[in-house]
Amino acid sequence: LIIGFGISGRHSITVTTVASAGNIGEDGILSCTFEPDIKLSDIVIQWLKEGVLGLVHEFKEGKDELSEQDEMFRGRTAVFADQVIVGNASLRLKNVQLTDAGTYKCYIITSKGKGNANLEYKTGAFSMPEVNVDYNASSETLRCEAPRWFPQPTVVWASQVDQGANFSEVSNTSFELNSENVTMKVVSVLYNVTINNTYSCMIENDIAKATGDIKVTESEIKRRSHLQLLNSKAS
């Protein structure tokens, strides 16, 4: 969490941002909140990016002001216009690109004063893994697949019964480049699995960590998966 304060002249206002990560090819949100004002027409929101000459986005007098916008962000940015009045200056970013990563500044002017805060935005690819029994294999085998990851993640298998066991000798992981030549499909196979056990396939890079669980019994197969973004720090 980064909390910034305003500069000289007018009073300073508190601006708060949260470091976050964007999934390339999908929509992203850069979070920023500020002390609200009672009049929308008195609020100016500017988003800037380190190393970029033009503005990322500007919203003033209740509408977008994009004359100074950098070409890199043209057609891809918006704020939540109906939430600005309550102090939400978060930026929507359409179709996140790898190059969108970097340090952003959320700069706010209201009738109460000015304030700004920085935000670290990471970009990559992350997706939920799905673990299935591989019935085509000669022995009891599990197959863990996740369609989109970048940078290349690590894959670790774990089991509820054999806690702490190292499965690297009985697993095989491959990474297949997707058609857009950036993200990769992750496939990991675990051999010699036993029945009545819960296995977990954990995929992690510096942006996200995802786990796919599977429990195989004589009568049923239960699956569960979850994903968490790493390093979501507020400023």
């Epitope: 919203f59 977008d64 057609g75 179709n95």
Partner: antibody, heavy 121, light 109 residues
Framework: QVQLQQSGAELMKPGASVKISCKAT????????IEWVKQRPGHGLEWIGE????????KYNEKFKTKATFTADTSSNTAYMQLSSLTSEDSAVYYC??????????????WGQGTTLTVSS | QAVVTQESALTTSPGETVTLTCRSS?????????ANWVQEKPDHLFTGLIG???NRPPGVPARFSGSLIGDKAALTITGTQTEDEAIYFC?????????FGGGTKLTVL
């Protein structure tokens, strides 16, 4: 006034490729997304994907990833969609539409007149 | 992929108010789905009516309005006119792709 003018009807043989054009007039071409949509009788509308002409950023519907390729020429304000390895399933009317993404306005506001593609041997 | 469902057909009379709805198979429609409504008239004539749930592009008559009603997106035509007879499609955005509904054939008798 804002207009999208598409190329004319096409009759193609199976296995061939076709390139459909969509010429934009009356606005800043580079700042708006061009969406591509397929319409087949009984199948409603299907989103093929989109391109942002200024940056060339594209997004494809998974179903059309190997079928369609989008390009845009900002000097002529024209967007293109190439469809490859044509089959009878590709016979349809194809539309381009302008999509504006902003804080206050975000909508499909202008559509081309459609390009009819017939694939037949 | 999500499925977007609309009424297949509705009938109304001139001057009446009619509401068309748009449901998502993934749960409640929210403002993040940027619900769009598009009108199709004969000869492949498409017009964007509503975007971002409730935004009306310039030139679209004020009788067309968009909203969220319960867990669905809705298009309301207040004081329907005979020229509003058409097929109405809704489109919902799912973070990285659009999905269109099957369309509602509106008859104005």
């Amino acid at each position: 006034q804002v207009q999208l003018q598409q190329s004319g009807a096409e009759l193609m043989k199976p296995g061939a490729s076709v390139k459909i054009s969509c010429k934009a007039t009356g606005y800043t071409f580079s700042s708006y997304w061009i969406e591509w949509v397929k319409q087949r009788p009984g199948h409603g509308l299907e989103w093929i994907g989109e391109i942002l002409p200024g940056s060339g950023i594209t997004k494809y519907n998974e179903k059309f990833k190997t079928k369609a390729t989008f390009t845009a020429d900002t000097s002529s304000n024209t967007a293109y969609m190439q469809l490859s390895s044509l089959t009878s399933e590709d016979s349809a009317v194809y539309y381009c539409a302008r999509y504006y993404f902003g804080s206050v306005n975000f909508y499909f506001d202008c559509w081309g007149q459609g390009t009819t593609l017939t694939v037949s041997s | 992929q999500a499925v977007v469902t609309q009424e297949s057909a509705l009938t109304t009379s001139p001057g009446e108010t009619v509401t068309l709805t748009c449901r998502s198979s993934t749960g409640a429609v929210t403002t993040s789905n940027y619900a769009n409504w598009v009108q199709e008239k004969p000869d492949h004539l498409f017009t964007g009516l509503i975007g971002g749930t409730d935004n009306r592009p310039p030139g679209v008559p004020a009788r067309f309005s968009g909203s969220l009603i319960g867990d669905k997106a809705a298009l309301t035509i207040t004081g329907t006119q005979t020229e509003d007879e058409a097929i109405y499609f809704c489109a919902l955005w799912y973070s990285n792709h659009w999905v269109f509904g099957g369309g509602t054939k509106l008859t104005v008798l």
